[in-house]
């Protein structure tokens, strides 16, 4: 028998730096985790202790934290080249800047092979991106062999910007083949390496014949044996293990996200490849593992940078931005009108000639807006102005509801209206009547939404059977301020960029800013 | 430009050590393994084992452990070889050089100067 | 440990000829190994990695090929520079070993 350790990563989304326990800025020093220094040492650690190591990310390394929007993917390749990592798969983030923005700062500076089996290449790019990322690399382990094939979420087009150059294929139809093409060249060893989520990482080991291992991401899926470590709750046990439709048992794992843990799972093979046992948990990287000095400083030489940017003028507003509890938690404000229509921007994508645009609604907590930005500084707009509006490091996500879940995610939105609470909803792409003297639950009497298969788009009523893409805060998705209604019925999520980041990216393509109030959120007494 | 600087010939006598040493410049000395090559005179090239600058991480071959100690001094981008119990055996000339990549594209592409180590009482 | 058995040993050759160097492998290094080049009293030079990449700045002249067990370096065209010692050297499990090397000398 023969012995691997697979290590894995995946949405580590720019959490270079240690982060406190919920992923967001490290405030407690003692109390904080993660972080690329802290990452190294515990690599290396197990690569002392033992013989056949391989480190892996499963994609979304891109997007996320001031150092993704300063550096653009240059601080992955330095910090992935340095902590060795043996092979990536592609993330839909990754295409967040363009092709472009892939190809110059990661693919050709990373030491390491980036792979997505599903994704091809047409046009000029075909030659342009040769050879930069690959579908499979076999690497040499110790005395042994080990392919790894990558896929990435066939959903990209719709989540990024990879442009019209690139065909996102089926995950299972493009890597059969891949594998099939390993097995010829005697590799009996296989790792399915990918960003589509958990479900897809399932169907994977279920339907491709010849992986053995399947190493995922996207879904930010938490997988524990015995008692988790932390705040997360586990989706199942580490590894997960599918049973195939030719009969093998397939470990599937996953290591939750944004550096936190570092997964860790031994796998047994006989002489044959087939796998006899594996084995594991994700490794929580809390301040018992100190950070590496080497890494550290690099850090922090890096970061330099960071704070000079935060500073430095980002477009300018010639209106009050008013961001004040008192006005976003009880009507609409255009603070909320701003970052709902930077996030509509952030996502416009003209996947088909039918649709305008495959989202046109926004919703988001009035809680979630944290400060006002007063346009008497000169009009200017920094991301430290922008840092204080939201504060909390989340990001602008994508989900599939229904119109029934968006019906009672606005009769929640004012069920105990009056009492500064921060469910009150700020919108894009819709228009919303309320009636407050009804009782909680009832209060909605209007509720159109801007149609996106339409050439001129305008606003019709909500249909409680239709189903509409919004994009939202991650902690609306989650369930946040009581929206569990949403986190329920949800028909499909998925993790969107870095708030801030989407904010300050609308302020500058418009170089100067006036939201208005404009009736997106009216309220009336009587009929209907 | 890249460039490894190797120190210059050493004369040793039977059972005694020698340190030789690997000084980098033009490029990012943490970010790229060094390696040692041997080179008895007249024969081929012999790989001894790698040593990762930024935390002193080393690999060796095994017919080179207990013969040769890897270590470096970042402050200075400088590799560090010594040999230890010296026999005729040990009479060559040795190289670094530097490797990029880690498991994607493997290959020496900058080499040392060479030191010669010649053995004898 | 993998073996790497170069051959010929030798070989003499006048200019503008084309030569070819082999490489066996005793076991599968999967395309993981490079060709150097070695001028008497000189440092080895890298001319050829993953079996057929060419290094930065090498004439095209040279080409490398192969998979498998068996690899091969060829020198079309042979230029007065390209005389001295020959090494393939495989990057599969350690210790990565390096060919006997190959004289090429001018006829």
């Known amino acids: 028998a023969w012995e691997l350790t697979i290590l894995h990563t995946n949405d580590v989304h720019s959490r270079l730096e240690q982060t406190s326990e919920d992923s967001s800025k490290c405030v407690n020093a003692s109390r904080c985790m993660g972080g690329v220094a802290r990452l190294f040492t515990k690599v290396q650690q197990i690569r002392r202790a033992e013989p056949n190591v391989l480190l892996l990310d499963a994609g979304d390394q891109y997007q996320g934290t001031i150092w993704f929007t300063v550096y653009k993917g240059a601080e992955v390749a330095h910090f992935m080249n340095a902590l060795r990592y043996d092979a990536m798969a592609l993330g839909n983030h990754e295409f967040d800047n363009g092709v472009e923005g892939l190809i110059e700062p990661l693919l050709k500076e990373a030491k390491f092979p980036i792979l997505s089996a599903n994704i091809k290449a047409k046009g000029p790019l075909a030659s342009q991106i040769s050879g930069l990322y690959l579908p499979y690399k076999v690497l040499p382990v110790g005395d042994e062999v080990v392919g790894i094939v990558g896929y990435t979420s066939k959903e990209t087009p719709f989540l990024s910007n990879p442009g019209t150059n690139l065909v996102f294929e089926d995950e299972i139809t493009a890597l059969q083949p891949e594998v099939d093409k390993l097995k010829t060249l005697n590799v009996n060893k296989i790792i399915a390496l990918g960003h589509s989520g958990f479900e897809m990482d399932k169907l994977i080991a279920q339907k491709v014949r010849g992986v053995d291992v399947v190493v995922g991401g996207h879904s930010n899926t938490f997988l524990y044996t015995g008692n988790p470590p932390s705040k997360e709750v586990p989706a199942g046990k580490y590894p997960f293990i599918v049973t195939s439709d030719d009969g093998r048992k397939v470990p599937v794992v996953q290591a939750y996200a944004f550096g936190k843990y570092l997964g860790y799972l031994k796998i047994e093979f006989d002489e044959r490849g087939n796998v006899i046992s594996s084995h594991g948990n994700p490794i929580l990287l809390n301040s018992s593992i100190p950070e590496d000095p080497s890494i550290k400083a690099d850090i922090n030489k890096w970061r330099i940078k960071l704070d000079n940017y935060s500073t430095q003028e980002l477009g300018k507003t010639i209106v009050y931005l008013d961001g004040s509890s008192q006005s976003c938690r009880f009507r609409e404000c255009n603070m909320g009108n701003l970052i709902c229509d930077a996030m509509i921007n952030n996502n416009l994508r003209h996947t088909d000639e039918m649709f305008w645009n495959h989202v046109s609604m926004c919703i988001l907590n009035g809680g979630g807006i944290r400060s006002p930005i007063d346009e008497r500084n000169n009009g200017t707009i920094t991301w430290e102005n922008l840092a204080a509006v939201l504060p909390f490091g989340g990001t602008f996500d994508l989900v599939q509801l229904k119109g029934s879940t968006l019906k009672k995610a606005f009769e929640h939105s004012v069920h105990r209206y009056g009492q500064s609470t921060g469910e009150f909803l700020q919108v894009g792409g819709i228009h919303v009547v309320y009636d407050l003297s009804r009782k909680p639950g009832d209060r909605v009497v209007k509720l159109d939404v801007l149609c996106t298969k339409c050439r001129v788009p305008s606003y019709d009523p909500l249909k409680m059977d239709e189903v509409y893409k919004v994009i939202l805060p991650n902690f609306l998705a989650n369930g946040g301020d009581g929206f569990q209604m949403i986190k329920d019925e949800l028909l499909r999520h998925d993790s969107g960029d870095q708030d801030i980041n989407v904010v300050s990216t609308y302020i500058s393509k418009m170089k100067v800013i006036y939201p208005a109030v404009e009736g997106r959120i009216k309220f009336s007494t009587g009929s209907h | 430009q890249v460039q490894l600087q190797q120190s210059g010939p050493e004369l040793v006598k039977p059972g005694a050590s020698v340190k030789l040493s690997c000084k980098a410049s033009g490029y990012t000395f943490t970010s790229y393994d060094i390696n040692w090559v041997k080179q008895r005179p007249g024969q081929g090239l012999e790989w001894i084992g790698w040593?990762?600058?930024?935390?002193?991480?080393?690999k060796y071959n095994e017919k080179f452990k207990g013969k040769a100690t890897l270590t470096v001094d970042t402050s200075s981008s400088t590799a560090y070889m010594e040999l230890h119990s010296l026999t005729s055996e040990d009479s060559a000339v040795y190289f670094c050089?530097?490797?990029?990549?880690?498991?994607?594209?493997?290959?020496?592409?900058?080499w040392g100067t060479g030191t010669t180590v010649t053995v004898s009482s | 440990d993998i073996q790497m058995t170069q051959s010929p040993a030798s070989l003499s050759a006048s200019v503008g000829e084309t030569v070819t160097i082999t490489c066996r492998a005793s076991?599968?290094?999967?395309?993981?190994l490079a060709w150097y080049q070695q001028k008497q009293g000189k440092s080895p030079q890298l001319l050829v990695y993953n079996a057929k990449t060419l290094a930065d700045g090498v004439p095209s002249r040279f080409s490398g090929s192969g998979s498998g067990t068996q690899y091969s370096l060829k020198i079309n065209s042979l230029q007065p520079e390209d005389f001295g010692s020959y090494y393939c050297q495989h990057f599969w499990s350690t210790p990565w070993t390096f060919g006997g090397g190959t004289e090429l000398e001018i006829k």
């Open positions: 076991g599968n290094v999967h395309n993981y």
């Open positions: 040593i990762y600058p930024r935390d002193g991480f080393t």
């Open positions: 050089a530097r490797k990029e990549g880690y498991r994607g594209d493997w290959y020496f592409d900058v």
